[in-house]
């Protein structure tokens, strides 16, 4: 014998209290598949979560995060604060820039420090996780008798090679 509940479509449930007839899901609940004996409570997007997709009788609500936060975890189960300078966003959340790289923004990726020697210059200020190195005059310019010191060249946008 066929289970009478199997005829109940998504958006309804098989109501045992009413001779197993198909009843619509109550407000703030849903059933995404047919033949359900109960409806699931809709997810509520509160606090740092905001509603990306409203709950319907056949599908759960979907949440994302308020500005300044980003989703982590399956189904945006968590909201993590946007990354700080000196970090980058990865699939596992905000991670510190490794030695030799920097990120001076709250978004974006860690980039290699400028290689001053490629331009024949010396390092005037060391790099950090948050700041690129500052290149100064070339070593030859710093030798005794040099008449002038050239101002630091602007740091070039370094290349990114993800290996």
């Amino acid at each position: 014998l066929q289970d009478p509940c199997s005829n109940c479509p998504a958006g309804t449930f098989c109501d045992n209290n009413r001779n197993q007839i198909c009843s619509p899901c109550p407000p703030n609940s849903f059933s995404s598949a047919g033949g359900q004996r109960t409806c699931d409570i809709c997810r509520q997007c509160k606090g740092v979560f905001r509603t990306r997709k409203e709950c319907s009788s056949t599908s759960n609500a979907e949440c994302d995060c308020t500005p300044g936060f980003h989703c982590l975890g399956a189904g945006c189960s968590m909201c993590e604060q946007d990354c700080k300078q000196g970090q980058e966003l990865t699939k596992k959340g905000c991670k510190d820039c490794c030695f030799g790289t920097f990120n001076d923004q709250k978004r974006g990726i860690c980039r290699p420090w400028t290689n001053c020697s490629l331009d024949g210059k010396s390092v005037l200020v060391n790099g950090t996780k948050e700041r690129d190195v500052v290149c100064g005059p070339s070593p030859a310019d710093l030798s005794p008798g040099a008449s002038s010191v050239t101002p630091p060249a602007p740091a070039r946008e370094p290349g990114h090679s993800p290996q």
């Epitope: 699939k91 820039c97 993800p162």
Partner: antibody
């Protein structure tokens, strides 16, 4: 040299299981980025199949592939594999393995920076 | 998730400025997890742009990317003979789990 190399039978019969292996050289599975499979039917576009997280073994599959696809990793052999069951002619494609780019801290960044050269698999009786 | 590129094909001449758009049916992760690839016949795709606007290593500066959320653009400022190829966008998403998707492709041919 950092590279990926797909291998497996070029001809599979309908209803059988397609099995491919991707051999990794020049780097090892010691980070939390994903190794993935992507396919391209002749004359058509790219289609993502699925990925496996080399850190914790989590798998992610395209909705059309769920129930038909298994991706696994063998760290000791530095390779990962794809199994696609119940194949039909619609599964005829060039199959690529690809590496998700890793951040400087070694975590997945969501795009693919290294691809194999691809292997053509034909489904026919 | 649907990623639609337009146009699906275009013809252009060397030196032309070429613009390709990519529209996603839902926002990519963090609004900028979008990459662009170039593919030539018989070859694997090659990464051009990542995180919507970052130029991959070794890619000429005539390639640039822009956009956020669901709408993105790849621009080739001055088309070169080696740029005739097919271009794909690719988004990364976090819904019930991590998910990747490719655009429908845009073939750039010689006028």
């Amino acid at each position: 040299q950092v590279q990926l190399q797909e291998s497996g039978p070029g001809l599979v019969k309908p209803s059988e299981t397609l099995s491919l292996t991707c051999k990794v050289s020049g780097f090892s599975f010691n980070n939390d980025y994903d190794m993935c499979w992507i396919r391209q039917p002749p004359g058509k576009g790219l289609e993502w199949i699925g990925c496996i997280d080399t850190g914790d073994g989590s798998t992610y599959y395209a909705s059309w592939a769920k129930g038909r696809v298994t991706i696994s990793v063998d760290s000791s052999k530095n390779q990962f594999s794809l199994k696609l069951s119940s194949v039909t002619a619609a599964d005829t494609a060039v199959y690529y393995c690809a590496r998700e780019a890793a951040s400087s801290s070694g975590y997945g960044m969501g795009y693919f920076d290294l691809w194999g050269q691809g292997t053509l698999v034909t489904v026919s009786s | 998730i649907q990623m639609t590129q337009s146009p699906s094909s275009l013809s252009a001449s060397v030196g032309d400025r070429v613009t390709i758009t990519c529209q996603s049916s839902q926002s990519v992760y963090d609004n900028n997890w979008l990459a662009w690839y170039q593919q030539k016949p018989g070859k694997a795709p090659k990464l051009l742009i990542y995180r919507a606007s970052n130029l991959a290593s070794g890619v000429p500066s005539r390639f640039s990317g822009s956009g956020s959320g669901t709408d993105f653009t790849l621009t080739i400022s001055s088309l070169q003979p080696e740029d005739f190829a097919t271009y794909y966008c690719q988004g990364t998403y976090l819904s019930s789990n991590w998910y990747w998707a490719f655009g429908t492709g845009t073939k750039v041919t010689v006028l």
